[in-house]
């Protein structure tokens, strides 16, 4: 089978068994796109026994084998295996054909992208190389966050990229903090976004053969101050055996800088509560959110005395939030016995 303009097996379905073994001759510099199975349940592609990653110059993605520009080292045996099994859907051998002009130079593969090279490859309009990185079209982010838009592309000659905001050329000169353009990464980054950054951002990728574009929508959410939010169900009721290690987890979300404490409820003179109605507690751990592991309470080598109620308390300049969980400690010799623990309490 000679490969011409672009190698593609049609239709994009699992082939019948008699079509299974094929040999394709591919010209150097030519893009390759082979399909295996339906897109949503496509098989996994392997080259010489190694599974192809979903990103990169040679990639296996949603049942497709894609090679941006065929190089000598891309020759070899490719298998497509059905998901979750070892059933061979395709068994292909790609063979290097002649390029339009040859050279004795032993060049780095990446240099083939340079149109100034002596190698000459078929011209190709721009195309998206990593569409899975462009799936998130709407970016709704809190003010102050960083936003990154990406439009990774390829083509021959290598395309250029430029950015538009609401249809107008965008260089970020009127934006406080400016913008960061990384042409090698086909990316636009804006740090510390503000409401005036809202809009439609378009990447326009073009070369002498053609152009493609993609729109991103940016919405900047103005922050409304609120006390910390604790993830529901954390910390969780836990049962452990004497001598084991326990981790209690608390996930805290807060715009304002939060302060976190881990508390253990204790009994004083037979009472769990003071005259003021507040529970007696012992502070086990206290730190800011940026501190390492503040959201995890580690209890090493637990004993019966460690059983009881534990509370994660988070506060910021606006207010406090807390959630509690019970730790039940079982004797070492009888791990089958379980004690019913009260439900975790959540207070807003």
């Amino acid at each position: 089978l000679e490969a011409s303009e672009e190698v593609e097996l049609e239709p994009c379905l699992a082939p019948s068994l008699e079509q299974q073994e094929q040999e394709l001759t591919v010209a150097l510099g030519q893009p390759v796109r082979l399909c295996c199975g339906r897109a949503e349940r496509g098989g996994h592609w392997y080259k010489e026994g190694s599974r192809l990653a979903p990103a990169g110059r040679v990639r296996g993605w949603r049942g497709r084998l894609e090679i941006a520009s065929f190089l000598p080292e891309d020759a070899g045996r490719y298998l497509c295996l059905a998901r979750g099994s070892m059933i061979v859907l395709q068994n292909l051998t790609l063979i290097t054909g002649d390029s339009l002009t040859s050279s004795n130079d032993d060049e780095d593969p990446k240099s083939h992208r340079d149109p100034s090279n002596r190698h000459s490859y078929p011209q190709q309009a721009p195309y998206w190389t990593h569409p899975q990185r462009m799936e998130k079209k709407l970016h709704a982010v809190p003010a102050g966050n960083t936003v990154k838009f990406r439009c990774p592309a390829a083509g021959n000659p290598t395309p250029t990229i430029r950015w538009l905001k609401d249809g107008q050329a965008f260089h970020g000169e009127n934006r406080i903090g400016g913008i960061r353009l990384r042409h090698q990464h086909w990316s636009l980054v804006m740090e510390s976004v503000v409401p005036s950054d809202r809009g439609t951002y378009t990447c326009l990728v073009e070369n002498a053969v053609g152009s493609i574009r993609y729109n991103y929508l940016l919405d900047v959410l103005e922050r409304s101050p609120h006390r910390p939010i604790l993830q529901a169900g954390l910390p969780a009721n836990t049962t452990a055996v004497v001598g084991s290690d326990v981790e209690l987890l608390c996930k805290v979300y807060s715009d304002a800088q939060p302060h976190i404490q881990w508390l253990k409820h204790i009994v004083i003179n037979g009472s769990s509560f003071g005259a003021d109605g507040f529970p007696y507690v012992q502070v086990l751990k206290t730190a800011d959110i940026n501190s390492s592991e503040v959201e995890v309470l580690y209890l090493r080598n637990v004993s019966a005395e460690d059983a009881g109620e534990y509370t994660c308390l988070a506060g910021n300049s606006i207010g406090l939030s807390y959630q509690s969980a019970w730790l039940t400690v079982l004797p070492e010799e009888d791990p089958t016995w379980t004690a019913a623990a009260p439900e975790a309490r959540c207070t807003d």
């Epitope: 990169g56 780095d108 240099s111 992208r113 998130k136 982010v141 960083t146 090698q184 990464h185 740090e191």
Partner: antibody, heavy 119, light 107 residues
């Protein structure tokens, strides 16, 4: 094979200057963005600076902004880090690292060069 | 800058154990997260890039998952050569910040 070799480290007094070099081989240098990453003794990794393959883009960590300058000479396959107004907290092993294409993951690292800032 | 918080800061495990290290970003970073392994006196080594892609030559017992703000590095069956320090690194923002590291020690 890909190789990165740092040099230029040494002992320097606070306020002094030093220029680190990173010689690259085994790949087309101008095709790759390069970064400097440092590690203070007994501490974690700290990203310092990045430069695009063609030198058109640079960026710095806040801790070194205005004092350090990253540059490259693609004809010599060499990456540089000019460090001025050095402080004691700049004491670290400095690594140069190559970025993967499309992803700012450092797939190749040099062996590191030690910079000690002390009086 | 985007802060990266790793947990735990250290852990003790035995050969054959399943080990999980988590990394949390201070904002959504999509899947722009990498994992590295570093042994004493050596340069770091890339294990996982873009949250879940295994770097070429890295054993398949290493895997990464997550997106947005919460990420996980898992070693399915710890081997003697895996005792090291592990770092996460975000590359969503221009400043490619690292987590503070997780030291995996022999129990």
């Amino acid at each position: 094979q890909v190789q990165l070799l740092e040099s230029g480290g040494g002992l320097v007094q606070p306020g002094g200057s030093l220029r680190l070099s990173c010689a690259a081989s085994g790949f087309t240098f101008s095709d790759y963005a390069m970064s400097w990453v440092r590690q203070a003794p007994g501490k974690g990794l700290e990203w310092v600076s990045v430069i695009e393959g063609d030198g058109s883009y640079t960026h710095y960590a806040d801790s070194v902004k205005g004092r350090f300058t990253i540059s490259r000479d693609n004809s010599k396959n060499t990456l540089y880090l000019q460090m001025n107004s050095l402080r004691a907290e700049d004491t670290a092993v400095y690594y140069c690292a190559r970025e993967k294409t499309y992803s700012s993951a450092f797939d190749y690292w040099g062996q590191g060069t030690l910079v000690t800032v002390s009086s | 800058d985007i802060q990266m918080t790793q947990s735990p800061s250290s852990l003790s495990a035995s050969v054959g154990d399943r080990v999980t290290i988590t990394c949390r970003a201070s904002q959504d970073i999509s899947s722009d997260l990498n994992w590295y392994q570093q042994k004493p006196g050596k340069a770091p080594k890339l294990l996982i890039y873009d949250a879940s892609n295994l770097q070429s030559g890295v054993p398949s017992r290493f895997s990464g998952s997550g997106s947005g703000t919460d990420f996980t590095l898992t070693i399915s069956s710890l081997q003697p050569e895996d005792f090291a320090v592990y770092y996460c690194q975000q590359h969503y923002s221009p400043s490619h910040t690292f987590g503070q590291g997780t030291k995996v020690e022999i129990k």
